[in-house]
């Protein structure tokens, strides 16, 4: 166990030019509050998921008028450090979010309004007990200047308050075999109580005879390195030597939420989701109001109307949960229309149209034909997105430019001659068959399948396809 | 919008029993507190009883005045809000609204309960 | 069990400003006790109006505030109406127990 702590010095105007206009004017008073969110491990998360590590907020700094005409200075800070308790071993490696607020004082109908006024990141290494590491960073046109680091809480100690210290038993030195406590020399390192054989840089206890493990390993003794591939079954298979996260309890068993809060199973652990009132890993921070700045990502805070709606978070587009803290996945609900690609871009919802259609959801069906002329008195037919020429008789391909061949695909059956003409073709009919194609045999009697053929034409005689 | 629909009211002997029954739509009924408020006639409000959601064991609460006679309840799949009046007294006569609690206060338009010999 | 008091009757005059309160008898109105202001109009018509002191309801017109003064919850109405004449009450929550005050009559002459 520990303390993440965080020391705001500076937050202003960054070098260059364009510097940004101050938050606060005459008219519009406002203070400055910061938010630190901490996460384990250097994965690139994005910032709404949750503060695995913890979070914090700062007090709210003295009230700032800009002065007229002055160009905006660094902005007066709120006092004190900003404390994230943490009840695990640290793990050496973590993303941190830090947020600046501006909380304005005017005149608001319904009390005082936040927004959020710059969003940095970042992904460290820090070990536990080091001295203050410095830090600058830069969001849009400002600059935050903060340094930070871990310590361990008596009586754990170590570059990730693992290991247990204990007041030294005798004046002089330490047991057989136990090291004195740096920087703590008149401490000594605690008798070894984790289950045998646990791993000394990978597991840690705070009991006797358990073996906890660190992020990213797994095993009894937390010697396998966990991975997520070759895992069957939802925690993976028994066998050790895969590397999968071994069947046992789950992380949600005796739920670990506290004050109502429901937990779901994650790859890495488990998160709960806390009711109104109360945030944090395990929902142990309570008594939360609009004062506290619970809402994220801009999320409008409104005091709520009985205690347990102690706040309600207004979140804006493309956020929701009750402190605006999960992103929607607005594409699961598929608005693009007729096959189009959804792009979720944060801000705003694309969707990119296959060929055919358009409209901000896909909704409109192009007209195919729209300039598409067919040639030589062709007609033009749509679908699906695309055109298709229906061509008059004697010409073909897809605009009907080509002259066809009516005789090319042998129309005249049981051996007709086929002659092309102006109008389509003409079958010559071998003795014995009539019709337009030669279809019709002539009955041995003189008399036809057919009704008596028309004037002028005889059975035998060419007949004309019209 | 959101509704609030009262139903079970009615008239009733002292130390009869009545059952009254809300109905609500158009929000996450799961998620919230929910009360009973009555008004008696040609008086104020008087706060009745309050039961909380799931997360919080859906925990109850009453006014001293109706205490072991009367019982909150819901039913979560049903989005349904009860109170069980039992052994009613003259005094209990009053309009019963049903009432949810959330940025600002959401009312149904009542039903009323008149106890009477 | 706490009380809650109320004036219970004030006139004001349209266009005026008229500042309706609600007192403890716990001691002063904090934000753990999300006073909410409700309006009733004859034939049992109850409206939300605020809610947390001073989180107005949609539709609620931009004259209804809600605010804590000194040790008390208060409702203003900034030019007041002839439709603002009704009964409202406040509603005080003590952890998880909710008391009314008994109700001011305004009457907007």
């Known amino acids: 166990a520990g303390v993440f702590e965080l020391q705001i010095h500076s937050f202003g105007p960054g070098p260059g030019p364009g510097a940004p206009r101050s938050p606060c004017s005459a008219r519009l008073p406002c203070r400055l509050f910061f938010r630190v969110c901490l996460k384990p491990g250097l994965s690139e998360e994005a910032a709404e998921s949750p503060c695995a590590l913890g979070a914090a907020l700062s007090a709210r700094g003295p009230v700032y008028t800009e002065q007229p005409g002055a160009p905006a200075p660094d902005l007066p800070l709120p006092d004190g450090l900003l404390q994230v308790p943490f009840r695990d071993a640290w793990p050496g490696t973590f993303s941190f979010i830090i947020e600046t607020w501006r909380e304005e004082l005017g005149d608001q109908i319904g009390g005082p309004a936040w927004s959020l006024l710059a969003r940095v990141a970042g992904r460290r290494r820090l070990a536990a007990g080091g001295p203050w590491a410095r830090d600058i960073q830069r969001a849009g046109a400002w600059e935050l200047r903060f340094s930070y680091r871990a310590r361990c809480e008596p009586p754990a100690v170590g570059t990730a308050c693992t290991r247990l210290c204990r007041p030294r038993s005798a004046p002089s030195r330490c047991g057989p075999g136990l090291r004195p406590c740096a920087p703590l020399e008149d401490e000594c390192e605690a008798p070894l109580v984790c289950r045998a054989g646990c791993s000394p840089e990978h597991g840690f206890c705070e009991q006797p005879g358990e073996c906890r493990c660190l992020e990213g390993w797994t095993g009894p003794l937390c010697t396998v390195p966990v991975s997520t591939s070759s895992c069957l079954s939802p925690r993976g298979p028994s066998s050790a030597t895969t590397g999968c996260l071994v069947p046992g309890p789950g992380p949600c068993d005796g739920n670990p939420c506290a004050n109502g809060g429901s937990c779901s199973e994650t790859p890495r652990s488990f998160e709960c989701t806390c009711p109104r009132g109360f945030y944090g890993l395990r929902c142990e921070v309570s008594g939360v109001t609009c004062a506290d700045g619970p809402c994220f990502n801009g999320g409008l805070c409104v005091g709520g109307a009985d205690p347990d709606s102690a706040y309600i978070c207004h979140c804006p587009p493309g956020f929701q949960g009750s402190n605006c803290e999960k992103r929607v996945d607005r594409c699961s609900l598929q608005p693009c229309r007729n096959g189009g690609l959804c792009l979720d871009l944060g801000h705003a919802l694309r969707c990119r149209c296959r060929a055919g259609f358009a409209g901000p959801r896909c909704e409109h069906d192009l007209d195919d034909c729209a300039g598409r002329a067919c040639a030589n008195g062709g007609t033009c037919v749509e679908g699906g997105g695309a055109h298709r020429c229906s061509c008059a008789l004697g010409f073909g391909g897809r605009d009907c430019r080509e002259r066809a061949d009516p005789c090319a695909a042998r129309p005249c059956a049981h051996g007709g001659r086929c002659y092309a003409h102006f109008s389509g073709l003409v079958c010559a009919c071998a003795p014995g068959y009539m019709g337009a194609r030669c279809e019709f045999p002539v009955h041995p009697d003189g008399a036809s399948a057919l009704p008596a053929a028309p004037p002028g034409l005889r059975p035998g005689d060419p007949q004309r396809y019209l | 919008e959101v509704q609030l629909v009262e139903t079970g009211g009615g008239l009733v002997q002292p130390k009869g029993s009545l059952k009254l029954s809300c109905a609500v739509s158009?929000?996450?009924?799961?998620?919230?507190?929910m009360n009973w408020v009555r008004q008696a006639p040609g008086k104020g409000l008087e706060w009745v009883a309050r039961?909380?959601?799931?997360?919080?064991?859906?925990?109850?609460y009453y006014a001293d005045s109706v205490k072991d006679r009367f019982t909150i309840s819901r039913d979560d799949s049903q989005s349904m809000l009860y109170l069980q009046m039992n052994n009613l007294k003259i005094e209990d006569t009053a309009m019963y609204y049903c009432?949810?609690?959330?940025?600002?206060?959401?009312w149904g338009q009542g039903t009323l309960v008149t106890v009477s010999a | 069990q706490a009380v809650v008091t109320q004036e219970s009757a004030l006139t004001t005059s349209p266009g005026e400003t008229v500042t309706l309160t609600c007192r403890s008898s716990?001691?002063?109105?904090?934000?753990?006790?999300?006073a909410n202001w409700i309006q009733e109009k004859p034939d049992h018509l109850f409206t939300g109006l605020i809610g947390?002191?001073?989180n107005r309801a949609p539709g609620v017109p931009a004259r209804f505030s809600g605010s804590l003064i000194g040790d008390k919850a208060a409702l203003t109405i900034t030019g007041a109406q002839t439709e603002d004449e009704a009964i409202y009450f406040c509603?005080?929550?003590?952890?998880?127990?909710?008391?009314f005050g008994g109700g001011t009559k305004l009457t907007v002459l």
């Open positions: 509603g005080l929550w003590y952890s998880n127990h909710l008391v």
């Open positions: 158009a929000f996450t009924f799961t998620t919230y507190a």
């Open positions: 039961i909380r959601n799931k997360s919080n064991n859906y925990a109850t």
């Open positions: 947390g002191h001073n």
């Open positions: 716990t001691g002063a109105v904090t934000t753990s006790n999300y």
């Open positions: 009432v949810f609690y959330y940025d600002y206060v959401y």
